[in-house]
């Protein structure tokens, strides 16, 4: 469960891949599309509002009782729209929604090497936001092998 309905902190940051491609958002036919692309040097990077929440592990998972805290994040590139996991389609989509946000909008934040982060679906542990064919997609990760896999690594720059 998420401990408290308010985020502990928020920040505005641009999101890029491990290989320095930018994550951009474009309004097309009244819905937002998400792209992974090389930006021209003079083009301003899109910013995303990251809201950070604390979430308690079930004690059976963490072995810590009430001590097993995770950091979760929601990502909003524009007012009232949030990134959401569509586990059926293995896709990442932007949806307009009101608070309280659905579980599909929450991602467990993982700090990774080289000051990168990964985003794991709250609703589907082991499934991460990743890059596939120049789009964001949900990617199943084998914990024992691929947690450092470059296609699920992202950089945040403020």
């Amino acid at each position: 469960s998420i401990t408290g309905i308010s985020p502990i902190t928020e920040s505005l940051a641009s999101l890029s891949t491990y290989n320095d491609q930018s994550i951009t958002f474009a309004l097309e036919d009244e819905s937002y599309e998400i792209y992974v692309e090389d930006l021209k040097k003079d083009k301003k990077k899109d910013k995303v509002l990251l809201s950070y929440y604390e979430s308690q592990h079930p004690s059976s998972e963490s072995g810590d009782g009430v001590d097993g805290k995770m950091l979760m994040v929601t990502l909003s590139p524009t007012k009232d729209f949030w990134l959401q996991a569509n586990n059926k389609e293995h896709s990442v989509e932007l949806h307009k929604c009101e608070k309280p946000l659905p579980d599909q909008a929450f991602f467990v934040l993982h700090n990774r090497s080289f000051n990168c982060v990964s985003f794991e679906c709250k609703t589907d542990p082991g499934v991460f936001i990743g890059v596939k064919d120049n789009h964001l997609a949900l990617i199943k990760v084998d914990y024992s092998e691929n947690l450092g896999s470059e296609n699920i690594l992202f950089k945040l720059s403020e």
Epitope: Y52, S62, G63, K69, M70, L71, L109, N111, R112, S113
Partner: antibody, heavy 122, light 107 residues
Framework: EVQLVESGGGLVQPGGSLRLSCAAS????????MSWVRQAPGKGLEWVSA????????YYADSVKGRFTISRDNSKNSLYLQLNSLRAEDTAVYYC???????????????WGQGTLVTVSS | DIQMTQSPSSVSASIGDRVTITCRAS???SSWLAWYQQKPGKVPKL??????SLQSGFPSRFSGSGSGTDFTLTISSLQPEDFATYYC?????????VGQGTKVEIK
Amino acid sequence: EVQLVESGGGLVQPGGSLRLSCAASGFTLSSYAMSWVRQAPGKGLEWVSAISGSGGSTYYADSVKGRFTISRDNSKNSLYLQLNSLRAEDTAVYYCAKTLYTTSWYGGFQHWGQGTLVTVSS
Amino acid sequence: DIQMTQSPSSVSASIGDRVTITCRASQGISSWLAWYQQKPGKVPKLLIYAASSLQSGFPSRFSGSGSGTDFTLTISSLQPEDFATYYCQQTHSFPWTVGQGTKVEIK
């Protein structure tokens, strides 16, 4: 209850080596990034090294890079710091510390051991 | 590397005083700043994390604020048990760095 107990400190000559250990209990060690932090006598805190939960990623302060090696054995619930080419300025109490969050290190160190003293002197 | 600069290095205050300690980062660290309290001969304790979240077990007279490069730790009404050294630490990016500490002493 979370417990971190350091051992392995002592008196060593300049250029010598030591291996510090930290025995962890009361939590699942593999779920957390762990760190070593030191404090020279009468001085402030200095972060030394960190290691990811799996042990796959390690990080060092510039002052110890190439001389110290952090490692962990999650099956033994233990964290280690190998100290080589020791210098007088490495004299300090060495603490092992556990991060607040299971998947993220953004929250800082929630739990600390009592520390073990390393004295480098001839 | 990100340098963390605390000020003042020491402060003399009386019981009931409001005490403010500042911490400045040499580059932006978002809200990823922790404050620790250390009493003489004791282990440091996590006091504030994510710049403003108070760690359980500490009273509400402690508060933290700031983001980016400038951060503040405030003790609204100093109590006898608050006399200690306080450290800020950035947890934004490696290598993690710690401020030099601020000693809060009895006037």
